[in-house]
């Protein structure tokens, strides 16, 4: 049970000595600088104090400084991730210092006592940028903190106890068990950093989630709800690992984070965009596709700074795999009469002719129940850029012939037996582009003919006054 | 054990300023949060603020801004809470407490009266 | 600022009975609540965090439950020693706010 998970290693038990840790030779965390392009070079590890070494290693005090930080570790080896996150920082900041803190150590033990060791490795990464901030022309505003799973509560702990404001700390996936509300200075918060930006992969509403449940940062962003990633799934992992095991689906999703960063920074061209939302659900009603007043910013890398008090949820759809931008659509569908509807809510797909493509059959999943004489609002989107929107088509796909269906009918038959088929009355549709903030007025082609029943399709056509744009430039142009 | 001892009781007058003291052993003490919080007579608990005396950080809650001020002596794992431009419903017991999964540990409390 | 609205402000009640104290946040703080008990000329004691984590030494009468905005404090045999002010506070985020407190008295 959670219980098992409680805190511990703390000021009432004074575990101010790193837990678990081997008596060997090797420092129990490491600064090792990545200088070569080569991912399997070993790189220079600095030394606290040794100015002559930082000399030595290349240490740009002017440049931007990254540290990454891993999380807890089953195997004591760095993990595939850390090597194409070093390259691509070094591809996009070419002067910056890219340096990993290796705790491994500390790291491979029993999760509880890797949990208890992050307040001291946090406390030497702090003690290294304090250090650092005795040289003049380091600034600790050029300090980008970037910390995956577990490395993201030390990410925490550093910018909590270095003297000053670190400039951001990134989030990936934060740890959740033992950090899911715990007080503000155990856990990774937006105090740490002058910009503190956090992804949700993996956060399960159920059972013990891997990452971190609540917003830890000044914008915490939940691809695909925060929860079941595209590609991961356990189809997914039987057929690109060996063995498709539960870990595996579990270390797809909260590696997720990982790569969605690395995506921000590689495939710049494609920016991902995430747009706040109160909640995952509403997200998915596409009610919350808007970029007004700061509500909605690229991800990873590029994420804009926020000034906001209080914290920002945001959410957006991705792909399963690089790059993972999709286009967001949000359609708003006022639905007259639905005639016949017994239980059974109608299966409807969309699909969306633009300049550019066409997108595939498009499912508009309903949330919760469709409203009638009432407008109905749905998420859709598309993995390629469709251009402007041109027209549509609804399909109302045929009800399967099972025996649940047919009574169901048949009920419906019994109930309303002058008007036994199943109809939706659908004049116009509102489409929204998440990523350009575009909107534009579809209206059926011929007015007289505006109902649909399974089996059936509607065609839309751009109504009279055609696109419609509130701001004469879209807001992603300045984000991008 | 962890023990916080709090400076003994103080009568100002308004205007005046406050300066309470809280002398910590049994942790390390660069390492926690220490927070002041105040109970007023027959009322509730309100926190003031913190520091965190390894790196001498603040968080103040503003409605004390500008007239609280929270620093540490390393060498006598001491923090001091000064409250200045003091009024007459500033009276309370001051208390300081060190933070960890809460206020874990809480010293024994300062009585600060304003009267004139 | 996060507000904690606390309920009953004082109860009356027996040894052994079961009481529960209730406190609302005016957003959601997720798990991040603490309990505290105070007894008069007394400094505050901490009894439960992270919502239902008993702190050391807490007797396993007293339990805590809930998350987002709406959390409870449960004493589910109340003895001699348990008359006395309860707070729940916030820790999700700065400033840390506390509720009005709930008053125990013996019926």
């Known amino acids: 049970s959670i219980t098992t998970l409680r805190p511990q290693g703390s000021l009432r038990d004074e575990h101010h000595k790193p837990t678990g840790v081997p008596a060997t030779a090797r420092p129990s965390v490491a600064f090792n600088i990545r200088t070569s392009k080569d991912p399997e070079q070993e790189g220079c590890n600095l030394s606290l104090g040794d100015s002559k070494l930082l000399e030595n290693c290349g240490f740009n005090m002017t440049a931007k400084t990254f540290f990454i930080i891993h999380g807890w570790t089953m195997s004591g080896m760095f993990e595939s991730w850390l090597h194409k996150l070093v390259s691509a920082l070094q591809m996009r900041e070419k002067d910056a210092n890219v340096v990993v803190v290796d705790w491994l150590p500390l790291a491979h033990q029993l999760y509880t006592d890797a949990v208890n060791n992050t307040r001291v490795v946090g406390q030497r990464v702090a003690g290294m940028l304090d250090w650092l901030q005795e040289k003049e022309e380091f600034s600790l505003g050029n300090v980008h903190l970037i910390g995956y799973s577990l490395g993201a509560h030390v990410a925490g702990y550093a910018g909590n106890f270095v003297k000053g404001t670190v400039g951001r700390i990134t989030g990936l996936d934060p740890a959740g068990p033992m950090f899911e509300g715990v007080d503000i200075n155990r856990r990774l918060s937006p105090d740490d950093a002058d910009f503190v930006d956090v992804l949700h992969t993996y956060t399960l509403s159920f059972g013990l989630s891997i990452g971190i449940r609540m917003p830890v940062g000044h914008i915490d962003i939940y691809p695909n709800g925060g929860d079941f990633q595209p590609g991961c799934g356990f189809n997914d992992v039987i057929g690109s690992f060996a063995y498709g095991t539960i870990s595996e689906m579990v270390k797809c999703e909260h590696e997720r984070a990982v790569h969605l960063f690395v995506d921000s920074l590689v495939n710049q061209d494609k920016p991902s965009f995430a747009f706040q939302c109160t909640d995952s659900s509403r997200f998915k009603r596409g009610i919350c596709l808007s970029c007004r007043k700061n509500r909605c910013n690229n991800i990873g890398y590029n994420a804009k700074k926020m000034r906001k008090k209080r914290n920002s949820k945001m959410y957006l759809k991705t792909r399963a795999g690089m790059p993972f931008k999709v286009y967001h659509y949000q359609l708003k569908v006022h639905m007259f009469s639905y005639n016949n509807s017994g239980d059974t809510q109608p299966t409807l797909y969309i699909t969306l002719y633009g300049s550019n493509a066409d997108s595939q059959n498009l499912p508009l999943e309903i949330v919760e129940k469709i409203e009638l004489n009432a407008t109905n609002t749905f998420l859709v989107y598309t993995e390629e850029d469709l251009g402007d929107l041109l027209k549509m088509r609804l399909t109302w796909e045929g009800v399967a012939h099972s025996w649940y269906n047919l009574w169901n009918e048949f009920r419906n038959y019994l109930s309303q037996p002058s008007n036994p088929s199943r109809e939706l009355y659908i004049r116009r549709i509102r489409v929204k582009s998440g990523e350009t903030q575009r909107k534009v007025t579809f209206c059926t082609q011929d007015p007289t003919k505006s109902s649909i029943s399974p089996g059936q399709e509607l065609w839309f056509h751009k109504c009279q006054d055609g696109w419609k744009m509130k701001n004469k430039t879209s807001p992603f142009v300045n984000l991008a | 054990q962890v023990q916080l001892v709090q400076s003994g009781a103080e009568v100002k007058k308004p205007g005046a300023s406050v300066k309470v003291s809280c002398k910590a052993s049994?942790?390390?003490?660069?390492?926690?949060?220490i927070a002041w919080v105040r109970q007023a007579p027959g009322q509730g608990l309100e926190w003031m603020g913190e520091?965190?005396?390894?790196?001498?950080?603040?968080k103040y809650n503003k409605k004390f801004k500008g007239r609280v001020t929270m620093t540490r002596d390393t060498s006598t794992s001491t923090v001091y809470m000064e409250l200045s431009s003091l009024r007459s419903e500033d009276t309370a017991v001051y208390y300081c407490?060190?933070?960890?999964?809460?206020?874990?540990?809480w010293g024994q409390g300062t009585t600060v009266t304003v009267s004139s | 600022d996060i507000q904690m609205t606390q309920s009953p402000s004082s109860l009356s009640a027996s040894v052994g009975d079961r009481v529960t104290i209730t406190c609302k946040a005016s957003?959601?703080?997720?798990?991040?609540v603490a309990w505290y008990q105070q007894k008069p000329g007394k400094s505050p004691k901490l009894l439960i965090y992270?919502?239902?984590y008993r702190f050391t030494g807490v007797p396993s009468r007293f339990s805590g439950s809930g998350s987002g905005t709406d959390f409870t404090l449960t004493i589910s045999s109340l003895q001699p020693e348990d008359f006395a002010t309860y707070y729940c506070?916030?820790?999700?985020?700065?400033?840390?706010?506390f509720g009005g407190g709930t008053k125990v008295e013996i019926k």
């Open positions: 957003q959601d703080v997720y798990t991040a």
């Open positions: 506070q916030q820790h999700y985020s700065i400033p840390r706010t």
């Open positions: 407490a060190v933070y960890d999964y809460g206020a874990d540990y």
């Open positions: 049994g942790y390390t003490f660069t390492t926690y949060w």
């Open positions: 992270s919502a239902s």
């Open positions: 520091i965190l005396p390894g790196s001498a950080k603040t």
